[in-house]
Interface confidence: medium
């Protein structure tokens, strides 16, 4: 008996108040289907109802969280319906406050190395979910460690490849309501570095400047990088600029740091638009020092 395929668009993790499309595909091409929810609170809008092609469900509430299956119309079956489809678990986010997501030792991970993603909260979540943006597969389910101050989970990810790099978020949930999730953590960009040769980094007018003077850092390479990323040691985040082809055949980006007040070690990386989370080796570090200022890091 033909078993249809149920899918959720844009994905199975849905913010409270948003809509999700449930699509039931029959290999035999029948486009009428019924939907059932196996657990959690009932959803009256599904009862005694036949859908055509796909169903736009929403605005979703915590009651919509749970496991769904569809049956497609099947004129050759004794009941007139196919066997039930694969299960699709709809998780509704925004029910609890957001956890925090960190990367140890940091979000820039050398190709082939391992990174630990730590999701933690002051809420006692027994379960955490780790979700990568743009991936329609179910999020990774992780068991939380409870402690007096809340809960956390450490997930070891590696060896690092471009396929694992991306924007991650984590969610928390409690045991008795496993599909009602917290708001998402702030996004964390995990970047794989060391995939291409290192660019060069230089400073104009030079790496030693007077306090309050303007300095521009130039990152360049003969590789066809679309984007350069500039990072400062011991600082989160990075500056990002589009590369420009120079007369000498190099691809370059100029980062105007403006009037500098304190120095530091800078590195730059190159990347391609098509793989935004896959970067080159870092440039050699460039120490920028500021004279006439006690905060010369």
């Amino acid at each position: 008996q033909d078993k249809p395929f149920l899918s959720a668009w844009p994905g199975t993790v849905v913010s409270e108040g948003q809509h999700v499309t449930l699509q039931c595909r029959s290999r035999l091409g029948f486009n009428e289907f019924s939907l059932s929810k196996e657990d959690g609170m009932p959803v009256p809008e599904l009862y005694n109802r036949i859908f055509r092609n796909s169903f736009l469900m929403g605005p979703v509430t915590p009651a919509h969280a749970g496991t769904y299956r569809c049956c497609s119309s099947h004129p050759h079956s004794p009941t007139g319906w196919s066997a039930p489809s694969n299960p699709v678990v709809i998780m509704v986010t925004g029910v609890h406050r957001k956890p925090s997501l960190l990367a140890h030792p940091g979000p820039l991970v050398k190709s082939g190395e391992t990174v630990i993603l730590q999701c933690w909260s002051d809420v006692r979540f027994e379960r955490f979910l780790l979700h990568r943006e743009g991936i329609t597969e179910d999020p990774l389910r992780l068991v939380g460690q409870l402690h007096d101050a809340g809960s956390q989970v450490n997930y070891s990810m590696g060896p690092m490849t471009p396929a694992l790099a991306g924007t991650y978020r984590c969610f928390g949930s409690v045991t008795h309501l496993p599909y009602e999730l917290s708001a998402p953590s702030d996004p964390l960009d995990i970047v794989v570095v060391g995939l291409y040769g290192k660019p060069s980094l230089s400073a104009q007018p030079g790496p030693t400047v007077q306090a309050g003077e303007n300095v521009t850092l130039s990152c360049s390479s003969r590789s066809l990088f679309d984007i350069y990323h500039l990072s400062r040691e011991a600082e989160a985040g990075e500056l990002r600029l589009t590369a420009v082809l120079r007369v000498n055949g190099t691809f370059q980006a100029n980062f105007p740091l403006g009037p500098v007040t304190h120095g530091g070690n800078y590195r730059c990386f190159g990347s391609f638009r098509a793989l935004p989370h896959a970067w080159s080796d870092p440039s050699d570090p460039l120490p920028v020092s500021v004279t006439g200022n006690s905060r010369n890091l």
Epitope: W9, G17, Q18, N53, S54, F55, G58, P59
Partner: antibody, heavy 122, light 108 residues
């Protein structure tokens, strides 16, 4: 300018079908919902259904389940509503509206088409 | 489904008068999901007030909205001729979205 342009008035026979169009301009068609609303002469507003042009997913008011079929064409940024087996009860003005939200959960209809008058008469 | 009942169905007010109309829901509605539309004869409804209290772009500040739970209202602080219209409340808290029957506001 954000606009929804609806097709012109229709005079149709009972038992036939009619297809009303709603062309969106001035915004990203697939980033919003298209809602359909019925208004009989001198009466209030009745929600017919909604389509997500991005996914093609629809939801409808039970009352219109066998009456209205909603579709959307992303390439032309146009939504359609086909009304079938027409009777005099279907004589009304039909509006399309953009489904938008404030914050994350607060849905409303912020832009409306001018309406398409459908008259069913023999 | 959530039923919205508007009262009065028809009302008239003098220019400069303060006007209040109400919308009662059959079940509690989130105040962020209760909206109002203005409609004049021969025209489509206009998006007027969203999330109970917020005025849509271009709506005069003499309009205001308030309420919570099952009871909501729209108020005009001093009636002007251009305010004569039918006003509909609308909830999109739960599917299906529903509209009230409307309050027709006329000039006395």
């Amino acid at each position: 300018k954000v606009q929804l342009q609806q097709s012109g008035a229709e005079l149709v026979r009972p038992g036939t079908s009619v297809k009303v169009s709603c062309k969106a301009s001035g915004y990203a068609f697939t980033n919003y919902l298209i809602e359909w609303v019925k208004q009989r002469p001198g009466q209030g507003l009745e929600w017919i259904g909604v389509i997500n042009p991005g996914s093609g997913g629809t939801n409808d008011n039970e009352k219109f389940r066998d009456k209205a079929t909603l579709t959307a064409d992303k390439s032309s940024s146009t939504a359609y509503m086909q009304l079938s087996s027409l009777t005099s009860d279907d004589s009304a003005v039909y509006f399309c509206a953009r489904g938008n939200y404030y914050g994350t959960t607060d849905w409303y209809f912020d832009v409306w088409g001018a309406g398409t008058t459908v008259t069913v008469s023999s | 489904q959530i039923v919205l009942t508007q009262s009065p169905a028809i009302m008239s007010a003098s220019l400069g008068e303060r006007v209040t109309m109400t919308c009662t829901a059959s079940a509690s509605v989130s105040s962020s999901s209760l909206h109002w539309y203005q409609q004049k004869p021969g025209s489509p409804p206009k998006f007027w007030i969203y999330s109970t209290t917020n005025l849509a772009s271009g709506v005069p500040t003499r309009f205001s909205g308030s309420g919570s739970g099952t009871s909501y209202s729209l108020t005009i602080s001093n009636m002007e001729a251009e305010d004569a219209a039918t006003y509909y409340c609308h909830q999109y808290h739960r599917s299906p979205p529903t509209f009230g029957g409307g309050t027709k506001l006329e000039i006395k």
